[in-house]
């Protein structure tokens, strides 16, 4: 008998997957930028705001070159999971106060979730180690006041913007190694 019938190409090649992940990350970065502008317009920030529960920025863009594919994807996935959790918390805790941003915040959450699934799929396709997610973090305390929630929103969107900017650079660099 001749060789067995092959399978039609059913799903994207990991390099194509990486391309679409970069596109999704870029569009999420733009969503975050627009949302940050809206937030600053409606609730001007007085300087930078921090939130202790947010992840620290994974890496400066300059140090990206030394990174390996698994560590970039693993760290990126962990950080984005944390931001997803913070966005969910923000929408729950600040529903009424941030109503003007609500459709956009909902879209951001959906796209963040989609990006996380893309990253996981990419790691599976490449057979890279996928660390178990951290044990569930303690629930985030509700903001002490409306203004506290707005400060948290500034911190979350600002941190997410930096992380996504780092992610786009990192993913583009990784593409050259695939």
């Amino acid at each position: 008998p001749g060789p067995p019938p092959g399978s039609p190409r059913a799903s994207p090649d990991p390099r194509a997957e990486l391309d679409s992940t970069v596109l999704l990350t870029r569009s999420l970065l733009e969503d975050t930028r627009q949302l940050t502008i809206q937030l600053k317009d409606k609730f001007p920030a007085d300087g930078d705001h921090n939130l202790d529960s947010l992840p620290t920025l994974a890496m400066s863009a300059g140090a990206l070159g030394a990174l390996q594919l698994p560590s970039v994807l693993t760290r990126l996935r962990a950080d984005l999971l944390s931001y997803l959790r913070h966005v969910q918390w923000l929408r729950r805790a600040m529903g009424s106060s941030l109503k003007t941003l609500e459709p956009e915040l909902g879209t951001l959450q959906t796209r963040l979730d989609r990006l996380l699934r893309r990253l996981q799929l990419l790691m599976s396709r490449l057979a890279l180690p996928q660390l178990p997610p951290d044990p569930p973090a303690p629930p985030l305390a509700p903001p002490s006041s409306t203004w506290g929630g707005i400060r948290a929103a500034h911190a979350i969107l600002g941190g997410l913007h930096l992380t996504l900017d780092w992610a786009v650079r990192g993913l583009l660099l990784l593409k050259t190694r695939l």
Epitope: G6, S7, R9, A10, S11, D13, P14, R15, P70, L81, L116, R117, Q120, L121, S124, R125, L126, A127, L128, P129, Q130, L131, P132, P133, L178
Partner: antibody
Framework: EVQLLESGGGLVQPGGSLRLSCAAS????????MHWVRQAPGKGLEWVAV????????YYADSVKGRFTISRDNSKNTLYLQMNSLRAEDTAVYYC???????WGQGTLVTVSS | QSVLTQPPSASGTPGQRVTISCSGS?????????VHWYQQLPGTAPKLLIY???ERPSGVPDRFSGSKSGTSASLAISGLRSEDEADYYC???????????FGGGTKLTVL
Amino acid sequence: EVQLLESGGGLVQPGGSLRLSCAASGFTFSSYGMHWVRQAPGKGLEWVAVISYDGSYKYYADSVKGRFTISRDNSKNTLYLQMNSLRAEDTAVYYCAAGVPDYWGQGTLVTVSS
Amino acid sequence: QSVLTQPPSASGTPGQRVTISCSGSSSNIGSGYDVHWYQQLPGTAPKLLIYSNEERPSGVPDRFSGSKSGTSASLAISGLRSEDEADYYCAAWDPSLSGPVFGGGTKLTVL
């Protein structure tokens, strides 16, 4: 069209060795993690081993750890499974699979019997 | 004993809708790891049917759909056809193995 073609299966005595090969074509082999998955006669699928796209990560099911070795040659688009100290319970059809796994070969039968 | 639990068998008549469940734990499906589904027709190799919980590879009819909630997932087949008679397996990444784990498989019979 994606093709994965396993070879190297056959009858071997307990304690013996066998080396399976899987020739890949129709896709960018070096961009995919590769798996070996087996299926004992009349049973379900059991994952055996995986190797990352560049060969730097290898993981094994507990049932084969220390006896089986997975490897790949990206220049030849070929995946390998070196099986040593074979046991009767290793009797199965061995499939080579790419990605999630997204693509599967047709399998090669390994029979361990005296 | 499989890490992912599936019913050993399921059945339906042509045109019906059947659902196959896949139950995991907090260490695999419940930890956010995606679920994939495979179809194995008699005497053939498995074929990817659904990936990332609900995505259909090109060429898979939209009669097949997947979903995931909490620590379990399910595969639904609507408009059942005789050619759907096969074994169906779910799979998810297991971090303790650094590899996928498969369910025990569900034999679907079209009556």
